[in-house]
């Protein structure tokens, strides 16, 4: 047998060389590049396992969009045809709660999650006999990377074996720890930086295949929470990084989400974007915002992919994406996941399992409506998936997809066998579809969420609500005491009330200056390298939030450390959520908060509000009867007509959909 090269096994403390063999069926499918379903026998630690695989049809596109750049920096859009891809999911016969994510492109490569162990498998280099290396994931050497606080072992959860009929593939993959009965879909966008691209020999195909493999691994981990990962886009910075990656992880994350909001969202709709970087941050494996998955401005994370395998890297991305999905670290909480450490443990442990705490955290996010964007099944032109009727994703050529025949029995609008609408139906799903009919134009489908938001309405000819817009950043709110920023009026009192209850309010400026000049975890202007930054007096209002009149102590599923600082006759209250260095601190003053006359907070600095680029003269542009929205169009108040609120009408904008319909009696009394 060929011996593995040093490079291939230098990261393993133990491994076996095996030769998997493929089980063939008597009824063979028509020849195709890769089978829809396939089974193999593999050996691990003296035992033979039969593994059953089916192509992960929900994962990748028919119109796979890959963005790259040419030497002049021009954006290039490519649609490589990879419908019959080689990425599979599956289970191990006879092993309860097992799951597999494998690619069968050039030999078998991927992850096998058994009851109490996870294995990696990959082709043996230079072998001509289909030999593979198999190893326990626990035997992979890893740098001691972290997201924050130190690692704590989690007690093992004992799994019960139950006698039952062998379930179908779909049942097996759905019945894992389904946190909520309704499947959620994360539309994921991955961005690969220039250094990682260079490290892959500047081979775009190799980068693409590796990221598809990564997405398949993520899907196999998230399916236990009834969450599906749908890869909707990939961008490779082939010509140079489009953000500054100098500085700490927090700086890079901030730069990345700003770039995402400005350039990426407009190009491809998605729920979360993850940046893949080669550069490390002194032991920090990644960083992401908590609970921001549906946010226009903060739904992102950064992930360090240096000298580690894609299998190990998958648990880093799962962790950072978990933060976006509302999951806090497991450390110091009573969590279990059936393994010695779980995905949301703060040390990047290479775990494959989400803990009970992660499930609860995600459930909280959905109950608080923080996960509304995860309910939509990706549109046909947005999902990188080979079309398949019955996968509950509306693929190209389909009008609807109600799932399995049993599920379709309950769907009044969709013909399950053809994935076409029933003859009488106009639609089968969407915010503007009711009883298989389009809701009338003028039906409210997305109400205002704050004084900096505007409503959207059905247009009467589509099942979808108009795209979400809000009042342009920089518009005054709270009686000129604050500015609108990403659809919210950002002011200190409101932030204090979110953390400390409805009676709380901002502490005096002296509190901010005194506490934030210290440069410790309770008072700082961010993190640089391995230490907290002291706030200059002029930036103190943009550091750690200081509140007074506190009557409630916050409960967010994670108990924060609370500090009380006496200052000139009042008590200043601040919090440190101790979420770890990979999570931006929700106890800091929010970006966009007004920190002085004509100034706002950005990156913990009090800067001129002109950075918001507010350029709307509502008197001239909207004739004093409206505001400018985030598309720089007038949203007219009731009684005035778009586009310029100059003539009498029914309000709204060119973006909002029609606000009125004489025939509309949707809920009228």
């Amino acid at each position: 047998a060929a011996r593995p090269g040093f490079q291939q096994t230098s990261h393993l403390s133990s491994y076996e060389i095996i030769t998997p063999w493929r089980l063939t069926r008597e009824r063979r499918e028509a020849p195709r590049p890769y089978s829809k379903q396939v089974s193999y026998v593999i050996q691990a630690e003296g035992k033979e396992h039969i593994i059953h695989l089916e192509r992960n049809k929900d994962l990748l596109p028919e119109d796979f969009v890959v963005y790259t750049y040419n030497k002049e920096g021009t954006l290039i859009t490519d649609h490589p045809n990879i419908q019959n891809h080689c990425h599979y999911r599956g289970y191990v016969e006879g092993v309860h709660n097992s799951s597999i994510a494998l690619s069968d492109c050039f030999g078998l490569r991927g992850l096998l999650h058994l009851e109490n162990a996870s294995y990696g498998i990959e082709p043996l280099q230079n072998s001509s006999h289909f030999e593979h290396i198999i190893y326990r994931m626990d035997d992979v050497y890893k740098e001691p990377l972290k997201c924050g606080v130190s690692n704590k072992d989690i007690e093992k959860e004992t799994a019960k074996d139950e006698e039952e009929e062998p379930p179908s593939m779909t049942q097996l993959l759905r019945r894992r720890r389904a946190v909520l009965p309704q499947t959620r879909y994360v539309e994921l966008f991955i961005v690969v930086d220039k250094e990682r691209y260079d490290m892959m020999g500047r081979n775009q195909t190799a980068v693409r295949e590796e990221m598809i493999l990564l997405a398949n691994y993520l899907d196999s981990m998230y399916i236990m929470l009834n969450i599906r990962i749908v890869l909707v886009g990939l961008e490779i910075w082939t010509n140079g990084n489009l953000i500054n990656i100098v500085g700490g992880a927090g700086d890079v994350l901030g730069n990345f989400v700003q770039w995402r909001e400005k350039f990426l969202i407009t190009r491809r709709r998605h729920d979360s974007a993850q940046l893949v970087l080669k550069k490390g941050f002194g032991g920090t494996a990644g960083m992401a915002f908590v609970g921001t998955v549906c946010s226009r401005s903060h739904a992102g994370g950064i992930n360090v992919f240096g000298q580690i395998t894609v299998e190990t890297f998958a648990s880093i991305v799962a962790h950072e994406l978990g933060h976006n999905l509302g999951m806090n670290h497991d450390d110091g909480r009573d969590c279990s996941c059936g393994a010695k450490s779980c995905i949301m443990n703060s040390g990047a442990s290479g775990s494959r399992n989400f803990s009970s705490c992660s499930a609860e955290d995600f459930e909280k996010l959905t109950l608080n409506k923080g996960g509304n964007c995860l309910l939509n099944i990706p549109k046909p032109d947005e999902a990188y998936s080979a079309p398949s009727c019955g996968n509950k994703l509306v693929d190209a050529g389909e009008e609807c997809d109600c799932g399995t025949p049993k599920e379709c029995e309950l769907d009044p609008c969709c013909e399950g066998s053809t994935c076409k609408l029933k003859s009488f139906a106009e639609c089968a799903y969407g915010d503007c579809c009711k009883d298989c009919r389009f809701l009338p134009g003028g039906t409210l489908c997305r109400g205002k969420t704050s004084e900096c938001d505007v409503p959207e309405y059905c247009n009467g000819s589509s099942q979808f609500c108009q795209p979400d817009v809000f009042i342009q950043n920089g518009y005054p709110c709270q009686n000129n005491k604050a500015y609108c920023y990403n659809g919210m009026c950002q002011y200190y009192d409101a932030q204090c009330q979110v953390i400390f209850g409805s009676k709380a309010k901002a502490a005096p400026k002296d509190c901010f200056i005194e506490v934030n000049s210290k440069g410790d975890r309770f008072g700082n202007c961010g993190f640089s390298g391995n230490e907290y930054k002291k706030c200059a007096t002029g930036n103190a209002l943009c550091g750690k939030l200081q509140c007074e009149n506190v009557q409630e102590i916050p409960v967010f599923g994670i108990v924060p450390a609370i500090i009380q600082t006496p200052s000139r006759g009042t008590k200043c209250w601040g919090v440190d959520f101790q979420l770890g260095s990979d999570v931006p601190d929700p106890g800091m003053v929010n970006e966009g908060t007004k920190c002085g006359a004509g100034k706002i907070c950005r990156n913990f600095q009090c800067v001129d509000a002109s950075v918001l680029n507010y350029d709307c003269d509502v008197q001239k542009k909207c004739h004093g009867h409206g505001v400018c929205n985030s598309n720089k169009n007038c949203h007219c108040e009731n009684g005035w007509a778009p586009p310029n609120c100059e003539t009498k009408g029914y309000g709204g904008s060119v973006d909002s959909g029609p606000t009125y319909n004489e025939m509309n009696t949707a809920l009228r009394d």
Partner: nanobody, 129 residues
Amino acid sequence: EVQLVESGGGLVQAGDSLRLSCAVSGRTISSYAVGWFRQAPGKEREFVAVISWTGGSTYFADSVKGRFTISRDNAKNTVYLQMNNLKSEDTAVYYCTADRFTTGSGRTSYPRPSEFDHWGQGIQVTVSS
């Protein structure tokens, strides 16, 4: 600046009626949808009723349907909530709300507090049984 002032609250017996008024100053209310919310001690603020800016649509919470009516008098810049056959569970602080972008029509679900920018101070209604 738009200001809302509620009046007409008080203590009544179960089965009695009350009419709440909401007087708006600072701007003409002709382009505002106006609603009423209420909050009982230890409970979340809940929707009661809304009238669209045109006056052509009204919506009521299921718990008050058939007992409460809402009307507007744009000439007086005032909105009224007529409450009949009051029950002890109607006891709460009642808030008048207004918004110039929320239309108050074409709804498939009840309004949320976040849809209204302007709020009154609230007025107490107590129904004794």
